[in-house]
């Protein structure tokens, strides 16, 4: 008799999830020699322990604490790039500007990027059929709680000038409900962070508007200022040229506004 299984609204665990996490961990330690002594099997055991045999709508930050003990990876606190709704460009940027880091450039972020996972209460099985959707099922699911936890810690670690890349093509350039808006903004430490600098990325080639005057950006400025952190904003009118100039800053065309 097939056992009844909870059907959730979201996609199931990414296929070959354990193998993927383990392989990513090994790859990361090979790319980052300062992590050469990390035992990836222990990392996977801690990751697994956070959600296996637990109800996937009842996950807490506490469940991820054993894994977070690994999160003491030292990223330079003044080289942090946050992003909202524009992940690909943020990652392209840190691939070129190697001394800056997004959350996904850290081990824990790298392990989980674009993956889905959940377990089932009281069984050691991973659910490959479906996982809870944040809106339709519950917010305290394994994936959402993981990103909330690592995002909070990442923001708490930041210092000096923190940069955030925002998508100027969206109706809400700054969205209070995004991970950036709901978690990271509120966990920047005013005693460590001097300035939050927003980079608003334009989508259209002919778009010459000053998106730093957008009402949602003004809202972000207000939230940040109330937290005793300075705010600045730059329009990135040509993201393609922006990346090109990061690669080749000596290029004569890179002195003009991008």
């Amino acid at each position: 008799v097939p056992r009844w299984r909870q059907q959730w609204s979201g996609p199931g665990t990414t296929k070959r999830f354990p193998e993927t996490v383990l392989a990513r961990c090994v790859k990361y330690t090979e790319i980052h020699p300062e992590m050469r002594h990390v035992d990836c099997q222990s990392v996977w055991d801690a990751f697994k322990g956070a959600f296996i045999s637990k109800h996937p709508c009842n996950i807490t930050e506490e469940d991820y604490q054993p894994l977070m003990k690994l999160g003491t990876q030292t990223v330079p606190c003044n080289k942090i790039l946050l992003w909202s709704r524009i992940k690909d460009l943020a990652h392209q940027f840190t691939q070129v500007q190697r001394d800056m880091f997004t959350l996904e450039d850290t081990l824990l972020g790298y392990l989980a990027d674009d993956l889905t996972w959940c377990g089932e209460f009281n069984t050691s099985k991973i659910n490959y059929q479906s996982c809870p959707d944040w809106r339709k099922d519950c917010s305290n699911n394994p994936v959402s709680v993981f990103w909330k936890t690592v995002s909070r810690r990442f923001a708490e670690a930041a210092c000096d000038v923190v940069h955030v890349m925002l998508n100027g093509s969206r109706s809400k350039i700054f969205d209070k409900n995004s991970t950036f808006g709901s978690v990271e903004v509120h966990n920047l430490q005013p005693e460590k962070v001097q300035t939050l600098e927003a980079w608003v990325i334009h989508g259209g080639r002919e778009d010459s508007r000053d998106l730093c005057q957008d009402p949602t950006i003004k809202e972000l400025e207000s939230i940040i200022s109330k937290r005793n952190i300075q705010f600045s904003c730059k329009n990135i009118y040509r993201p393609d040229k922006f990346l090109q100039c990061v690669k080749n800053p000596e290029d004569s065309s890179c002195t003009s506004e991008i």
Epitope: P33, R36, H37, K69, T72
Partner: antibody, heavy 118, light 110 residues
């Protein structure tokens, strides 16, 4: 085969300075992390410092941070440990070690004795 | 600075099995590889076990390593007189940003 030969040890007064050297051969020196490890008389092994390959990043034990400086010269296949403000508790045999990719110390020198005494 | 905890001594008769424990925390053994070194007085230390349970070539299979949680152990089976030495465990420690060694265990063959 891999050879690591330390030199520069000796007797020095408290507050004095000493520079240890380690000559490496038998492997591509510039590819590997290198470390200094010490053993005080009658005590156990204690890691002192490490230096990365590439653009060097340095790591130090709390007990020596700010007083000791680890460095390398890839052109000369040499590792160094500059020891300043020496204390009696720095008296030990200092070993130079090659670190493999998993973090293990695969090859060790025979050690050089540093004695800090007035 | 706190190192890893090992028993000061262990002993056994020739041919016996001896196990040495090494306990630490999540900042060292928990998420990092454990290494074991053999040290005979007046000689350079020698790598016995790396990555928790791997033996370098030339190390007899009488030596084996294991790790569970925040602890590790080294087992020597078929103890021989030449195994009389000091044995050290080691691991990277995140909170110190450096390696920590155990206090060392002196193995005596009775």
């Amino acid at each position: 085969q891999v050879q690591l030969v330390e030199s520069g040890g000796g007797l020095v007064k408290p507050g004095g300075s000493l520079r240890l050297s380690c000559a490496a051969s038998g492997f591509t020196f510039s590819d590997d992390y290198m470390s200094w490890i010490r053993q005080a008389p009658g005590k156990g092994l204690e890691w002192v410092a490490s230096v990365s390959n590439g653009r060097p990043t340095t790591y130090y034990a709390d007990s020596v941070r700010g007083r000791f400086t680890i460095s390398r010269d890839n052109a000369k296949n040499s590792l160094y440990l500059q020891m300043n403000s020496l204390r009696a508790e720095d008296t030990a045999v200092y070993y130079c070690a090659r670190e493999a990719w998993g973090g293990e110390f695969t090859d060790w020198g025979q050690g050089t004795l540093v004695t800090v005494s007035s | 600075q706190a190192g890893l905890t090992q028993p000061p001594s262990a002993s056994g008769t020739s041919g016996q099995r001896v196990t040495i424990s090494c306990s630490g925390s999540s900042s060292n053994i928990g998420f990092h590889f454990v290494y074991w070194y053999q040290h005979l007085p007046g000689t350079a230390p020698k790598l016995l076990i790396y990555k928790n349970n791997q033996r370098p070539s030339g190390v007899p299979d009488r030596f084996s390593g294991s790790k569970s949680g925040n602890s590790a152990s080294l087992a020597i089976s078929g103890l021989r007189s030449e195994d009389e030495a000091d044995y050290y465990c080691a691991a990277w420690d995140d909170s110190l940003s450096g390696y920590v060694f155990g206090s060392g265990t002196k193995v005596t063959v009775l």
